[in-house]
Interface confidence: low
């Protein structure tokens, strides 16, 4: 699986979105894990509704919420009031039985408020090397930005 | 970090950031600043991968270009057009879970 790349801004909602082909997993719930350390295990998150059939209803853990498009094929996680801590190697998954497939594996990168000195100290460097093949980036700002528009809050 | 020094207002300086020990392609870098008695501040970001996504803080906005060589594991600050209040220590960081590492910095100095 390639790692597509999710940016936010500290503060604000980040929408990730994994695209899937919803005949094949037809019937499955999905989970949002986050992935401790390359070869770790992935970290149940939030899950879709117990019963498929109301997959549609948001579930929220904490500030993760996650609903499921299962007729166009699209998960879809929130992260409110993103935080620099959020950043990390997340995944979508199908779930069948007691095994998991990975629809996407997601890096959620994190931009830090330039405004909100308070975390000036909690941007990292990471403590093991990462590889990513062909990681591409998508663009999940929470609010709409015009071509070269600068999502730095207005200073005062 | 390296390239800071002393320079008169108006002149310019290169900063330089070598990373290691990560997939430097993959993650969003940025430039801060401190100055003595004051909050370390945001100055510049770009974006992973090619590096088209690009941020400047108001203050160097115009005068500051921040760019990368994904190949070489570099991230640079252009600074052009400098002024008195640029005058600060300066950091390249990346945002990724790990532990904190903020290096020495570069000092810069814009003094006639």
């Known amino acids: 699986h390639n790692t597509t790349v999710f940016q936010g801004v500290a503060g604000q909602s980040l929408q990730v979105s994994c695209p899937y082909d919803s005949m094949k997993h037809w019937g499955r719930r999905k989970a949002w894990c986050r992935q401790l350390g390359e070869k770790g295990p992935c970290q149940r998150v939030v899950s879709t509704h117990n019963l498929w059939l109301l997959s549609f209803l948001r579930r929220w853990n904490g500030s993760t919420a996650i609903t499921d498009d299962t007729l166009g094929g699209t998960l879809t996680i929130t992260l409110r009031n993103l935080q620099p801590h959020d950043a990390g190697l997340y995944q979508c998954q199908s779930l069948h039985g007691s095994e998991a497939d990975t629809l996407r594996k997601v890096l959620v990168e994190v931009l830090a408020d330039p405004l909100d000195h308070r975390d000036a100290g909690d941007l990292w460097f990471p403590g093991e090397s990462e590889s990513f093949e062909d990681a591409h980036v998508e663009h999940s700002i929470s609010r709409s930005l015009l071509e070269g528009e600068i999502p730095f809050p207005p200073t005062s | 970090e390296s390239g800071g020094g002393l320079v008169q207002p108006g002149g310019s300086l290169r900063l330089s950031c070598a990373a290691s020990?990560?997939?430097?392609?993959?993650?969003?870098m940025h430039w801060y600043r401190q100055a003595p008695e004051k909050e370390r501040e945001l100055v510049a970001i770009?974006?992973?991968?090619?590096?088209?996504?690009?941020n400047y803080a108001d203050s160097v906005k115009g005068r500051f270009t921040i760019s990368r060589d994904n190949a070489k594991n570099m991230v640079y600050l252009q600074m052009n057009n400098l002024k008195p209040e640029d005058t600060a220590v300066y950091y390249c960081?990346?945002?990724?879970?790990?532990?904190?590492?903020w290096g020495q910095g570069t000092q810069v100095t814009v003094s006639s």
């Open positions: 770009i974006g992973s991968q090619g590096g088209t996504y690009t």
């Open positions: 960081n990346v945002v990724y879970i790990g532990r904190p590492n």
């Open positions: 020990g990560f997939a430097f392609g993959n993650y969003v």
